[in-house]
């Protein structure tokens, strides 16, 4: 299991910027416009534009309320007029440089509209949002805009019982079959487009990936076994001409594996996914947050998957087929029969075109019938190194974003920012042999779940934005200035931070920084380069005989042990003479002359089998 975060920052301790509007709740849709330095925020009945550099500065707002008549009709259907029968913004996607595509639940009558960014007013198109946005604000959803067409995963009806992955397109609208083998009570988590590789084969197609958890079709138990999935469709899909008309011909799904090897620990509830794309990274990497189905202990894990691994399952893997196996929990088995040509579920690529299959519309019915009946792959998608990057106990992770940053020595590190259901943000760096949890920041005053996380990775200014029911918080990627000494700065093992001996401060590393000469950073936590020992200041105290002295010592690191020394001997709490407050401050009871002298508070932190010792405080005590 991963260690506890080294540092814990309380809500008011660090520089967080907040945005919220009184009376407005559910800030669950965030969209960044990097070129405009604007963050768009979709909340309940409202959309805001705020300054991305300082989100407390609101630029525009527009309200999209439900009429009383609609609210009443919704309430007549048994829904809550005060909460459910309102308009929760669920889709906030870029349509052009001057407009956004916005959809809301609209009192169980999902509706979409175009938001003009110049006037910041809705155009009043009021398109039917069925299949693009859920009816129920409590239902899962995901969407991504690709080439002006909205790809969505949501529910298609009032009850939420008909799941759908669809493409809203005037040219070629497509959707999944309403059949259990395709989607079985899914909980949608994430969707994104992966563009064809520039150095990949000619005529490749862009693909849209959907991540969700669904009830298993392949196994049947007394309880509903949940399985995390990745599905993909091809951007160029136009459906079939007869079989799979207006349906995906390229819809395939596979199981995502995230488990601790040689243990029964299986993480099968997908919470969130982030696609890491970075210069120097030869292919995108999917980072995913999981929790176990029976999570009474509060466990969470992060697994990472390469695009190549996912693609291999779909392009070369075996298929599964429905089977009646008596007295068995297994309901689907590997299909070992002949597979039609072209390969079912494959995109139309140059190879297909060479065989005259210029479009999915002229794929053979055999291929289409096969993919209609066999949407599930037998092969599973395994994580990088066949194990989770991180397993954390006593925490329920909700969202994840990942930044790839270059340390002072030129090495690239993946830094994960993972939010919790109690309003905290964990920051963890993936090192060669371990994951180091740098810090935990309490983003919200109250312990409320983080609903959405967004990373802005514009060079020179990087922030994490978190949305919750009560508002949005903006946090920098690092709080370097909070590390008061060289040792602290290095022990943080934060790739964004380095110690500047010139200004005797821990500074944020900017990629384009030229004056980083002489800066100190060591991702292994080696503090031996920290030569400028801080000037030893001391606190002088005078106490009366028989009294009690409290000597303060402030230690932030959760990984360090506080050691008190008197006349160079370590003090133990077991002695009736001494007591500790919060494992840090020292109490000395029944003071006498013999207690006069120098008391030192040291922090001892184990890093890579080495103990780093730091003097935190020095007290000179005189008993009169």
């Amino acid at each position: 299991f991963a260690p506890v975060p080294r540092l814990t920052w309380e809500h008011g301790e660090v520089g967080l910027v907040q945005f919220h509007k009184p009376g407005i709740f559910n800030y669950s849709a965030l969209l960044m416009s990097e070129d405009k330095d604007t963050l768009y925020v979709g909340a309940r009945e409202a959309v805001f534009a705020v300054n991305a550099l300082n989100i407390s500065e609101k630029q525009h707002e527009v309200y999209w309320k439900v009429s009383e008549d609609k609210k009443s009709k919704c309430a007549e259907k048994g829904k809550s007029k005060q909460t459910e029968c309102l308009n929760y913004i669920r889709v906030l996607q870029p349509l052009s440089s001057t407009s956004l595509y916005v959809c809301g639940t609209n009192a169980f009558q999902p509706t979409c509209d175009h938001l003009n960014l110049t006037s910041f007013k809705f155009l009043g198109k009021s398109e039917d949002g069925k299949g693009r946005c859920p009816f129920d604000p409590a239902h899962s959803y995901t969407s991504v805009m690709v080439g002006g067409e909205l790809y969505s995963g949501t529910s298609y009806n009032f009850l939420g019982s008909e799941p759908i992955i669809s493409r809203n397109s005037s040219h070629s609208p497509l959707r999944t079959e309403y059949a259990i083998p395709w989607l079985n009570e899914p909980s949608f988590v994430f969707a994104d487009v992966i563009q064809k590789s520039p150095d990949g084969p000619e005529g490749e197609d862009d693909k849209v990936y959907f991540f969700f958890t669904e009830v298993s079709v392949e196994y049947e138990f007394v309880f509903k076994l949940m399985i995390p999935r990745v599905a993909r469709v091809c951007k160029g899909d136009q459906g079939g001409l007869r079989t799979l008309q207006k349906k995906w011909t390229s819809f395939l799904k596979a199981r995502l594996i995230c488990s601790k090897p040689d243990s029964g620990l299986v993480f099968n509830i997908l919470q969130d996914v982030f696609v890491l794309r970075a210069p120097g990274l030869k292919e995108p990497v999917f980072y995913a947050v999981f929790t176990p189905q029976l999570n009474n202990v509060g466990l969470s894990a992060v697994c990472a998957y390469t695009l190549a691994t996912v693609e291999a399952v779909f392009s070369r893997g075996k298929y599964m087929q429905s089977a009646t196996v008596e007295q068995s929990h297994t309901k689907w088995v590997r299909y070992n029969g002949p597979v039609p040509t072209p390969r079912p579920g494959a995109c139309i690529d140059s190879e297909a075109r060479a065989a005259n299959y210029t479009s999915s519309l002229n794929l053979p019915d055999k291929t289409l019938q096969f993919v209609k009946d066999h949407p599930l792959m037998d092969d599973s998608v395994t994580p990088i190194d066949n194990r989770p990057k991180l397993i954390k106990k006593d925490v329920n992770y909700t969202q994840i974003v990942v930044d790839r940053t270059q340390a002072l020595d030129g090495t690239f590190y993946d830094v994960m920012f993972i939010s919790t259901d109690r309003g905290a943000l964990h920051k963890a760096v993936i090192l060669t042999k371990e994951v180091h949890v740098i810090e935990e920041t309490q983003l919200f005053r109250d312990s409320e779940p983080v609903l959405t996380l967004l990373l802005s990775s514009k060079k020179g200014r990087k922030f994490v934005y978190a949305g919750s029911n009560s508002g949005v918080v903006q946090a920098p990627l690092a709080f370097c200035e909070k590390h008061g000494s060289c040792e602290d700065c290095v022990l943080a093992r934060d790739p964004y931070c380095a110690w500047s001996p010139a200004i005797k401060a821990c500074v944020t590393l900017h990629q384009e920084e030229a004056s980083s000469r002489g800066w100190i950073q060591d991702m292994s936590g080696d503090t031996s380069s920290c030569l400028d020992k801080s000037k030893e200041s001391f606190n002088q105290h005078f106490f009366k005989h028989g009294g009690t002295a409290e000597l303060k010592c402030f230690q932030k690191s959760n990984l360090a042990r506080v050691v008190w020394k008197f006349q160079n001997g370590e003090l133990k709490a077991a002695s009736p003479k001494y007591g500790f407050v919060g494992r840090k401050h020292l109490l000395i009871f029944n003071l006498s002359d013999g207690d006069s002298g120098v008391y030192q508070c040291l922090s001892e932190e184990r890093v890579r089998n080495k103990t780093v010792s730091q003097l935190l405080a020095k007290h000179v005590l005189e008993v009169k």
Partner: antibody, heavy 122, light 108 residues
């Protein structure tokens, strides 16, 4: 230029089997996505779809007439044949064959023959 | 169900708009095609895949498909548009093409 022409008997007795041929030119039934279909239209009535055969030799039939219909192709002769057993006077109609276009703009009955009127009478 | 229902007839004055509807269960899940047939001639396609117009078909012909109803609209109707119009779709549950009952358009 695509042309299709239906041929066969103009008069058939009840209970007999009707055999119709569709000879075509300007396209090949070996080309990916191409199909040939049969449609009929009783005098003064609506169009009724009968059967289809595609380049991959997939065959589809009208469910109400499935037991009576057989469609086949002879690619070397550029011909599609439809047989319909147990003819009845209600089967009196103009029988059309048509080419189904393929690809992005496909799916429709793109080119039609002029049709052949078949009368079922004793 | 394998039925496509059309109104038997529609009358329209020249220059006006004629709307011909075709109804069937969950029709928007299917592609709808529209054919025009004049007496003694084979049908001619006017709209394919719900709303696409083949080359050579005038712009006044347009199509839409939503819910259980597909509509063929002829705007600025001309005398030469007088004909029978059929909708058509592929019924995937029974693997067959189905034609509508047909609508006779009369230009007054």
């Amino acid at each position: 230029q695509v042309t299709l022409k239906e041929s066969g008997p103009t008069l058939v007795k009840p209970t007999q089997t009707l055999t119709l041929a569709c000879s075509f030119s300007g396209f090949s039934l070996t080309t990916t996505g191409v199909a040939v279909t049969w449609i009929r239209q009783p005098p003064g009535k609506a169009l009724e779809w009968l059967a289809l055969i595609d380049w991959d030799d997939d065959k589809y039939y009208s469910t109400s007439l499935k037991t009576r219909l057989t469609i086949s192709k002879d690619t070397s002769k550029n011909q599609v044949v439809l047989t319909m057993t147990n003819m009845d006077p209600v089967d009196t109609a103009t029988y059309y064959c048509a080419r189904i276009a393929s690809g992005d703009s496909g799916g429709y009955f793109a080119d039609w023959g002029q049709g052949t009127l078949v009368t079922v009478s004793s | 169900s394998s039925e496509l229902t059309q109104a038997p007839s529609v009358s329209v004055s020249p220059g006006q708009t004629a709307s011909i509807t075709c109804s069937g269960d969950k029709l928007d899940d299917k592609y709808v095609y529209w054919y025009q047939q004049k007496p003694g001639q084979p049908p001619v396609l006017v709209i394919y895949r719900d709303n696409k117009r083949p080359s050579g078909i005038p712009e006044r012909f347009s199509g839409s498909n939503s819910g259980n109803t597909a509509t063929l609209t002829i705007s600025a109707t001309q005398a030469l548009d007088e004909a029978d119009y059929y909708c058509q779709a592929w019924e995937s549950s029974s693997d067959q093409y189905v034609f509508g009952t047909g609508t006779k358009v009369t230009v007054l």
